[in-house]
Amino acid sequence: KKVVLGKKGDTVELTCNASQKKNTQFHWKNSNQIKILGIQGLFLTKGPSKLSDRADSRKSLWDQGCFSMIIKNLKIEDSDTYICEVENKKEEVELLVFGLTANSDTHLLEGQSLTLTLESPPGSSPSVKCRSPGGKNIQGGRTISVPQLERQDSGTWTCTVSQDQKTVEFKIDIVVLAFQKASSTVYKKEGEQVEFSFPLAFTLEKLTGSGELWWQAERASSSKSWITFDLKNKEVSVKRVTQDPKLQMGKKLPLHLTLPQALPQYAGSGNLTLALEAKTGKLHQEVNLVVMRATQFQENLTCEVWGPTSPKLTLSLKLENKGATVSKQAKAVWVLNPEAGMWQCLLSDSGQVLLESNIKVVPTWPTPVQP
């Protein structure tokens, strides 16, 4: 007997072929011998089966000896053995209908778990194999669980249900609600304007929620809330902002914050959280601010950085067009009695310059002795 797998809500064609390519009498019945459809003359007739209103046949194919039955909007309970009676012979087709659904909303926060449940007909023993958009393979039986969703799990999951060497494929769209980046660092010279951007890794028709940026300055003993805001249908409105610093926020997505000037006392790290309406949990993005200052005081040329820097970063003072260089894996470098000229302070990571500041050292003339 032929086995056909179908998907819940889908349409399936059960084929039945006669040896002679001509119009002939045929009937489709279920395992209880209840007539579903058949022909009387040229007319398609329907029987008392529950399926009848969803069953059809293609008249144009009858001349080719093809007496298929098409079942629309498949239900799990349509799983049965169907019998096609044509030319005094009986053809049996076993239809198995499966459904695969996500237990929760398909819009999930990063870190949350996803459970896919398989609906299957009694007596079947299917196996399920799912592949994430990122290429992760997960296998299971009646349920498939993904304990901690990651950003790269966003997209179309392809799940293959196998039974009796036959397969049927399901596609489920999963949206992982997260920021595009888990963390980002902004490098600025003292006094420069700072732009923080928090792009989302998803798009929703309506996006409503509230958020806050907490800031831990390197020089401060505790963190403080710099800004709180509301998000309504992708429109941003500020609720509360500190007086120092006076942050500005863009009214449209992506979330965008402007700090008028980078100062050493602002250097540090922040955590932007976004709570979305009707979702439990929050989206997080860490942001770091590194500030550089180059100063000359009397006979001392100093370059300093504040904020979260990794120990492998190098801070250098270099005289332009000259070989004179002072480098340290530290947060401050200095040169005593620097030569006159344009000095560069460089913060670099494995030779890649992250931040630079130029300072001009003017020649110092001896002070004339008073007569």
């Epitope: 809500g9 889908d10 349409t11 064609e13 040229l42 059809d56 293609r58 008249k59 144009s60 001349d63």
Partner: antibody, heavy 115, light 107 residues
Framework: QVQLQQWGAGLLKPSETLSLTCAVY????????WSWIRQPPGKGLEWIGE???????NYNPSLKSRVTISVDTSKNQFSLKLSSVTAADTAVYYC?????????WGQGTLVTVSS | DIQMTQSPSSVSASVGDRVTITCRAS??????LAWYQHKPGKAPKLLIY???SLQSGVPSRFSGSGSGTDFTLTISSLQPEDFATYYC?????????FGQGTKLEIK
């Protein structure tokens, strides 16, 4: 709600090959047949041919020698190729879902054949 | 091929009128017939299938009848949005064929 979206080149020179694609959104792809129908300016509708998800085709004998309909089940798409076009092939081309009746239809693509 | 012949090729009527369009098949097609409404620049829309079954969402002022070779589409009380071209189609055998169309115009 099933929707059919179609696209392809709108201007061809005689002897070129017409190529159109139709994507099916929001509904079952298997179990149905997928058709191409055309309507020359000021004339009636003409059925070109059909295909199902497994690639089984039926063509209008009047066009059979020049027509190829193919299917890409991974994308829920089907395509029409009509070779050696002439001015007589200028028409609005529609894709449609069919068991016995055509429903729904794509929005239509005007294809003009002109030298 | 089965030839489908519609009459009249055009008809003028007013809002509220009752209009009947006929379709004749060149051979017996039982009730394997559909009716479509087509407006300029739009896709055709299925109105009636299996000769007399009303497609879901289609107003009840549309009705179909007939069997064998002769079929009719009736609009009981014309509405402004009904002015369009109407086609019949046979699904009895390949190739599927359509009538040449009946243009329904405002009088």
């Amino acid at each position: 709600q099933v929707q059919l979206q179609q696209w392809g080149a709108g201007l061809l020179k005689p002897s070129e090959t017409l190529s159109l694609t139709c994507a099916v959104y929001g509904g079952s792809f298997s179990g149905y047949y997928w058709s191409w129908i055309r309507q020359p300016p000021g004339k009636g509708l003409e059925w070109i041919g059909e295909i199902n998800h497994s690639g089984s085709t039926n063509y209008n004998p009047s066009l059979k020698s020049r027509v190829t309909i193919s299917v890409d089940t991974s994308k829920n798409q089907f395509s029409l190729k009509l070779s050696s076009v002439t001015a007589a092939d200028t028409a609005v081309y529609y894709c449609a879902r069919v068991i016995n009746w055509f429903d729904p239809w794509g929005q239509g693509t005007l294809v003009t054949v002109s030298s | 091929d089965i030839q489908m012949t519609q009459s009249p090729s055009s008809v003028s009527a007013s809002v509220g009128d009752r209009v009947t369009i006929t379709c004749r098949a060149s051979q017996d097609i039982s009730s394997w017939l559909a009716w479509y409404q087509h407006k300029p620049g739009k896709a055709p829309k299925l109105l009636i299938y299996a000769a007399s079954s009303l497609q879901s969402g289609v107003p009840s002022r549309f009705s179909g009848s007939g069997s064998g070779t002769d079929f009719t589409l009736t609009i009981s009380s014309l509405q402004p949005e009904d002015f369009a071209t109407y086609y019949c189609q046979q699904a009895n055998s390949f190739p599927y064929t359509f009538g040449q169309g009946t243009k329904l115009e405002i009088k």
